[in-house]
Every structure is written in structure tokens, then in C-alpha cells.
């Protein structure tokens, strides 16, 4: 539709959204035997029910509870990898290190990864033209509330040593306004989580700075310590080599610092 006629500032619902969600659900449940019991039609109905006919600025975590219930999944609580502003590398890592999990390796995260969706108040229509932008329109939109809900639950489930991958190329390596900074950090359970270990991923080949000394990392350490969780930090100077060494840990070049 013409730009003026769009209700919201953000892009509209992803094309073929219902078909995509359903297809992803079927694929995921086929690949993961522990989720074979899941009825994907019911999952889609619950997903749809969370936002259809509701004003896309008045979505609540409660709206997503039926979906959360259907998507309940047990992942090894000591094998959780969080990430902030570096999704691709985090996903490449868990594709190799198969015993570790990002949120997008769970059913609900997998269903919604990279998708946008919203409805319209009082109609059963999906809005393919525009959806609310978190900054320009409203924060309680279907996509933001979904990720806040699943991220909170994912963080709450974590135990022992939790890892987080952070983007060392950004001005704020740790950003309090990111999902990690605003949701996950505050929902790690001190009685279960012993340590948060940050992996700061370097962007430049010749960048030998210790980014663990960055002021935003110190801010993260302070927040975590106040929550009675230990904090540790590692520089990943060569992300390409890092991934290579995860694939082939016996490689002779993998004994040196990466």
C-alpha cells in the first residue's frame, strides 16, 4: 500500500508467515525426537491466538502463555549460549558444538527467528503492510513481547556456567538496552547460575586490544556481581580460527590463543 496508508513505521508481517511457522515446526519436530509429540497445528493456532484481533501495541506476555506451554522444552541448563548483536556467529558455533544451545536452537526460537508479524485490532487479518517499530511506535508489539517472553524463560532455565557471545566491533559491546542486557541478564537465577562467561568477539584482524577491559564489559561485570553471580571474560581475537578450532580441536594451531 502507499507509504502514508501504512499504519506503522516498521516492516509488515513476513510473507507467507503462517506457512513458514507451520513448516518450521514440522521440520523441527522431525529433527528433534524429544519434540515429536508436538502438534504443529496447535502450535500455529496458539501462535496466531497471541496476536490476531489484538491491537499490536497492547500485546502482553500473557497472550503468549498458550504458545509457551505448547513449546515447553528441556535443554541442558549448563549448555546455554546467549548472544548480543552477533547472532550469526553464535548460530554457526552451536551448529558445530551441537551440545550447546542458543534460544534459536529451541523450538520457539527456531519458529520465530528473523520473522516479523502483527495483526489488527478487532479483525482476523494479518497485517502484511506494516508492523509497529519498537522505537517509533511502541514496545509492546507482538515481535518484541514474544522475544522478551522466550528470552526471559530461556535465561531462567540456565544453570552452572552460562556463556554469552558479545560483538567487540560495536561501540557498546554490552548494551543495557539489548534483549541480553534488559531481559536475560536480570533473569539468570543466582541460586542456579555460578558464572557468566562473556566471549568478546573481535572484528579486526589486527585488533589485539583486551576488550574485556572495555567500560561496558565492566558495567556488565558489576551488574552480574551484584546479582551474586561470578563473571569471567575472554577475548576471541580470531572468530574464524575460533570456529575452525571448535570443528577440529586437535589441530596443532588450536593450542595458541584465539
Amino acid at each position: 500500500v502507499p507509504r502514508w496508508r501504512q499504519q506503522w513505521s516498521g516492516p509488515g508481517t513476513t510473507k507467507r508467515f503462517p506457512e513458514t511457522v507451520l513448516a518450521r515446526c514440522v521440520k523441527y519436530t522431525e529433527i528433534h525426537p524429544e519434540m515429536r509429540h508436538v502438534d504443529c497445528q496447535s502450535v500455529w493456532d496458539a501462535f496466531k491466538g497471541a496476536f490476531i484481533s489484538k491491537h499490536p501495541c497492547n500485546i502482553t506476555e500473557e497472550d503468549y502463555q498458550p504458545l509457551m506451554k505448547l513449546g515447553t522444552q528441556t535443554v541442558p541448563c549448563n549448555k546455554i549460549l546467549l548472544w548480543s548483536r552477533i547472532k550469526d556467529l553464535a548460530h554457526q558455533f552451536t551448529q558445530v558444538q551441537r551440545d550447546m544451545f542458543t534460544l534459536e536452537d529451541t523450538l520457539l526460537g527456531y519458529l520465530a527467528d528473523d520473522l516479523t508479524w502483527c495483526g489488527e485490532f478487532n479483525t482476523s487479518k494479518i497485517n502484511y503492510q506494516s508492523c509497529p517499530d519498537w522505537r517509533k511506535d511502541c514496545s509492546n508489539n507482538p515481535v518484541s513481547v514474544f522475544w522478551k517472553t522466550v528470552s526471559r524463560r530461556f535465561a531462567e532455565a540456565a544453570c552452572d556456567v552460562v556463556h554469552v557471545m558479545l560483538n567487540g566491533s560495536r561501540s557498546k559491546i554490552f548494551d543495557k538496552n539489548s534483549t541480553f542486557g534488559s531481559v536475560e541478564v536480570h533473569n539468570l537465577q543466582p541460586e542456579k547460575v555460578q558464572t557468566l562467561e562473556a566471549w568478546v568477539i573481535h572484528g579486526g584482524r589486527e585488533d589485539s586490544r583486551d576488550l574485556c577491559q572495555d567500560p561496558t564489559i565492566k558495567e556488565l561485570e558489576s551488574i552480574i556481581s551484584k546479582r551474586n553471580i561470578q563473571f569471567s571474560c575472554k577475548n576471541i581475537y580470531r572468530p574464524d580460527k575460533f570456529l575452525q578450532c571448535v570443528k577440529n580441536p586437535e589441530d596443532s594451531s588450536c593450542t595458541s590463543e584465539i
Partner: antibody
Framework: EVQLVESGGGSVQPGGSLRLSCAAS????????MHWVRQAPGKGLEWVAV????????YYADSVKGRFTISRDNSKNTLYLQMNSLRAEDTAVYYC???????????WGQGTLVTVSS | DIVMTHTPLSLSVTPGQPASISCKSS???????????LYWYLQKPGQPPQLLIY???NRFSGVPDRYSGSGSGTDFTLKISRVEAEDVGVYYC?????????FGGGTKLEIK
């Protein structure tokens, strides 16, 4: 059949105010953007204002900006146009029209005449 | 603002004969979504306007198939294959790609 019925027109002096109403029926009013369009006597059509389905977005023609306010009450299935600081050139038949989803008008009311004269 | 220009301003047609009305816009009405936001309305004497054609060539429900719309970009045409007495009135083109929405000045159709 979709019905739109305007009311509230009449004669007013320059500088005066009027509030037009448009009662909608036979469709889900709260799902549609709505427009006001006017037509001066013997002249062509001029778009005046539009409001989104939930009232969150409103746009106006430059000729009425700051003087006219479009609003809606979805619980009453009614569209409004508050017209202040009226001028002689605002004399026209005012139509409310339903947006077709792309910015055009698929249904129109019968119109209400506003006359501004001293 | 986008300016919409009609030609001719008026025409007189014998019943059963064809009629053609042209509308030009001052800029392209083609949107990046592939749609062209051009409408045709007919205002019969003493009545409100009624939608005939939307998005250049789509007939609105209940509109007789003797009406057809064509064109692209900035040049558009409304054709009536066989004019009937009930077709008299003023025909307006309108664009909705950009605010303010703008109408052409109209073409008055009369029966000979």
C-alpha cells in the same frame, strides 16, 4: 449494504465552528480507515482528511490543517470532523468515505452541506 | 502535490457509441509494491461520487463491464464501450500514492 450517513452541516458565520458526524453501519467500522472529502458548489472534489482504523494516525489537506480535526468513536461507529475558524472557501458539501485499503474510497455518504457566509 | 489533468473537460456522446476519457498525473503513480494507485469515480447529477475502477483497471463490484480502465505510470484512460443514458455525470480520476490525495478536475459526459 454499507451505509454512511453524514449530519451536522448548516450555515455558520466566518470564524465560527461546526462538528460534522458520519454514522456508519453494515460493516466493521473499527477495521477501516475513513476519509472526509468535500465539494464546493459547482466545483470538483477535494480530499480533506483521513484517520486510521484505531484513530492513531491522522492526516490533513494543507487548506484545513490546524483548523479541522478528524476523530472517531469506534464504540459508536461514528466518524467526526470538527471544523473551527471557518472561512467562506470552506463552503461545500462534505462527504465521509470509507477507505478501500489502498487509500481510495469504495463507499461514500450522501453528504452534508456546510455554508460559511456573513 | 501530484496534479491530475483530465482531457477532454466535456464530451457529448450518442447512446451506443464508445467514449474515452484521459487522465495524466504529474508524476508516476507506480508504487514499489508493483501497484499503480489510480482510481476512477463517476458522480451522477445530485448524487455522491461512486467508485468505478481501482488500481487502474479493476472494476469495482456491480460496475458494468462496458467500463474499462487502462494505462500505466502517468497516462491513464477510462473507456465506455457503449454509452448509455445512465452514464451521464462527471468522471474524476484520483491518485492515492501520495498525500494529499488529489482528484482531476473532472470530465463531464453528456448524451447527444
Amino acid at each position: 449494504e454499507v451505509q454512511l450517513v453524514e449530519s451536522g452541516g448548516g450555515s455558520v458565520q466566518p470564524g465560527g465552528s461546526l462538528r460534522l458526524s458520519c454514522a456508519a453501519s453494515e460493516f466493521t467500522f473499527s477495521s477501516y480507515w475513513m476519509h472526509w472529502v468535500r465539494q464546493a458548489p459547482g466545483k470538483g472534489l477535494e480530499w480533506v482528511a483521513v484517520i486510521s482504523y484505531d484513530g492513531a494516525k491522522k492526516y490533513y489537506a494543507d487548506s484545513v490543517k490546524g483548523r479541522f480535526t478528524i476523530s472517531r468513536d469506534n464504540s459508536k461507529n461514528t466518524l467526526y470532523l470538527q471544523m473551527n475558524s471557518l472561512r467562506a472557501e470552506d463552503t461545500a458539501v462534505y462527504y465521509c468515505a470509507r477507505d478501500d485499503g489502498s487509500g481510495g474510497f469504495d463507499y461514500w455518504g450522501q453528504g452534508t452541506l456546510v455554508t460559511v457566509s456573513s | 502535490d501530484i496534479v491530475m489533468t483530465h482531457t477532454p473537460l466535456s464530451l457529448s456522446v450518442t447512446p451506443g457509441q464508445p467514449a474515452s476519457i484521459s487522465c495524466k498525473s504529474s508524476q508516476s503513480l507506480l508504487h514499489s509494491d508493483g501497484k499503480t494507485y489510480l482510481y476512477w469515480y463517476l458522480q451522477k447529477p445530485g448524487q455522491p461520487p461512486q467508485l468505478l475502477i481501482y488500481e487502474v483497471s479493476n472494476r469495482f463490484s456491480g460496475v458494468p463491464d462496458r467500463y474499462s480502465g487502462s494505462g500505466s505510470g502517468t497516462d491513464f484512460t477510462l473507456k465506455i464501450s457503449r454509452v448509455e443514458a445512465e452514464d451521464v455525470g462527471v468522471y474524476y480520476c484520483m491518485q492515492s500514492i501520495q498525500l494529499p490525495l488529489t482528484f482531476g478536475g473532472g470530465t463531464k459526459l453528456e448524451i447527444k
